[in-house]
Interface confidence: low
């Protein structure tokens, strides 16, 4: 911690400018007024302070705002955000999407840090739900974001937000997560026509129940094998051979290559051999 020393004569900072990069740590501590720093935070990022100098500036803000920084300061933290600990961030109340974007920009190109994860959690909890604009923002910065959510967080995603979800955002989701997201997607896309609906719902089908798969089999959707392999085993098992044939359309031949893998393996074992033989693929039940 920087020692408290009197500011040398003539060194008292009147504004936050480039001259401060020549100040020693103790001079920054003694000569920069915390309130001045708070009002001119937007200038800090334009000045090439060292990490050690940034530590001093953070310390000054911490003293000024022991209960947590106001949003007016948070929005302009810039690279000083990288100095914050998750404990610091838990004290914040971030409500503006612009503030969130500004801080995510600082961390852009890096993996989600504990600081960013905490910031996002604070933001989402503060809003009470993951609205479409927030989800748009978060998945733009972190495509895997949706699949890193806990049950409580996922439950706060309203169906309207599902429109912001791209297929790649669901790449790392497992069936239990899709179980939560699928009914929301079904609700969100319910007014679309058959082929358009299938294109949108396809990424979420890992959470679909048997009755919805049966309904899709009646719509000539030609589901690809990659999607079929991600379906819940318990949802696939009750499907008849005819239903799977209709569901996959021309892709049904792909079942042979996947016959040793779930859910295909388990489904095959549930079928009558006579029915499997109608596919002409040599599948053995």
């Amino acid at each position: 911690e920087v020692e408290k020393t009197a500011c040398p004569s003539g060194k008292k900072a009147r504004e936050i400018d480039e001259s401060l990069i020549f100040y020693k740590k103790w001079e920054l501590e003694a000569c920069v007024d915390a309130a001045l720093l708070a009002t001119q935070m937007d200038r800090v990022n334009a000045i090439p302070f060292t990490y050690e100098q940034l530590d001093v500036l953070k310390h000054k803000l911490d003293e000024l705002y022991p209960q947590g920084y106001p949003e007016s300061v948070i929005q302009h933290l810039g690279y000083l955000f990288l100095k914050m600990s998750p404990e610091d961030i838990r004290k914040w109340n971030v409500t503006s999407l612009e503030t969130l974007k500004a801080l995510l920009e600082v961390n852009k190109g890096h993996e989600m840090s504990p600081q960013v994860a905490t910031l996002i959690d604070r933001f989402v909890k503060g809003r009470g739900q993951l609205d479409k604009d927030t989800l748009d923002t978060l998945t733009a910065f972190y495509p895997g974001y949706l699949c890193s959510l806990s049950p409580e967080e996922l439950s706060s995603v309203p169906p309207s937000s599902i429109w912001a979800v791209r297929p790649q955002d669901l790449d790392t989701c497992d069936p239990r997560q899709l179980d939560v997201l699928y009914p929301k997607a079904r609700l969100a896309f319910q007014n679309m026509n058959g082929s358009e609906y299938f294109v949108k719902i396809q990424s979420f089908l890992g959470g679909a129940p048997t009755e919805d798969l049966k309904a899709l089999s009646q719509q000539n959707v030609s589901m690809d094998l990659a999607t079929f392999m991600k379906l819940r085993t318990d949802a696939v098992l009750p499907l008849t051979v005819a239903e799977v044939q209709k569901l996959l359309g021309p892709h049904v031949e792909g079942l042979k290559a996947e016959e040793r893998h779930r859910p295909v393996r388990d489904w095959i074992l549930r079928q009558r051999q006579d029915d499997l033989d109608t596919l002409g693929l040599g599948l053995q039940g």
């Epitope: 960013v116 905490t118 049950p151």
Partner: antibody, heavy 116, light 112 residues
Framework: EVQLVESGGGLVQPGGSLRLSCAAS????????MHWVRQAPGKGLEWVGY????????EYNQKFKDRFTISADTSKNTAYLQMNSLRAEDTAVYYC?????????WGQGTLVTVSS | DIQMTQSPSSLSASVGDRVTITCKSS????????????LAWYQQKPGKAPKLLIY???TRESGVPSRFSGSGSGTDFTLTISSLQPEDFATYFC????????FGQGTKVEIK
């Protein structure tokens, strides 16, 4: 095959510290959460907390928030439980378990005994 | 936190018996958006880790024998072993994972 192997347990004096490790294999470490759950002799299961290895984000049972810290090293596929200011009532088998929602795979546990 | 209460705390039964264990949660673990009950059942044998049997209140984990079944919704749940086998003598826990993570105190199934 998913495997979770805990280590680091043993005898420690009241007021002492201990760091438990949980080495994970057989799945992608960063796409699941890692929990610590403990079980005192002859008692039920008690959730300690979890970490998202991909982000370092942690959540704790309020009861342990001040004394226990969960961390993870993604390069080693290992999660840790740092326990400080240990008390006799912390004597338990400590399990790590992975999850998405529920805890689907557990380690065999490591016994921590706090006694003078 | 949601409290989980199991009953009975222990029971004695014979091979072939039908065994029923109940679990009550202090508030509903049914999530309205997907109509799923965030409740699981585990089996634990002495000196071993808990093994997942049932999740979503009624979905059997892969590889779990069909004699194990789960039912119930909201706050009241049941684990049923239709015909007790020698390897089923163990302690059974319920677990809610909707809001944080809590467990029932366990039901020990012993040989009569």
């Amino acid at each position: 095959e998913v495997q979770l192997v805990e280590s680091g347990g043993g005898l420690v004096q009241p007021g002492g510290s201990l760091r438990l490790s949980c080495a994970a294999s057989g799945y992608t470490f960063t796409t699941y959460w890692m929990h610590w759950v403990r079980q005192a002799p002859g008692k039920g299961l008690e959730w300690v907390g979890y970490i998202r290895p991909s982000t370092g984000y942690t959540e704790y049972n309020q009861k342990f928030k001040d004394r226990f810290t969960i961390s993870a090293d993604t390069s080693k596929n290992t999660a840790y439980l740092q326990m400080n200011s240990l008390r006799a009532e912390d004597t338990a088998v400590y399990y790590c378990a992975r999850s998405r929602w529920l805890l689907d795979y557990w380690g065999q546990g490591t016994l921590v005994t706090v006694s003078s | 936190d949601i409290q989980m209460t199991q009953s009975p705390s222990s029971l004695s039964a014979s091979v072939g018996d039908r065994v029923t264990i109940t679990c009550k949660s202090s508030q509903s673990v049914l999530y309205s958006s997907n109509q799923k009950n965030y409740l699981a059942w585990y089996q634990q044998k002495p000196g071993k880790a808990p093994k997942l049997l049932i999740y979503w209140a009624s979905t059997r984990e892969s590889g779990v024998p069909s004699r194990f079944s789960g039912s119930g919704s909201g706050t009241d749940f049941t684990l049923t072993i239709s015909s007790l086998q020698p390897e089923d003598f163990a302690t059974y826990f319920c677990h809610q994972y909707l809001s944080s993570y809590t467990f029932g105190q366990g039901t020990k199934v012993e040989i009569k």
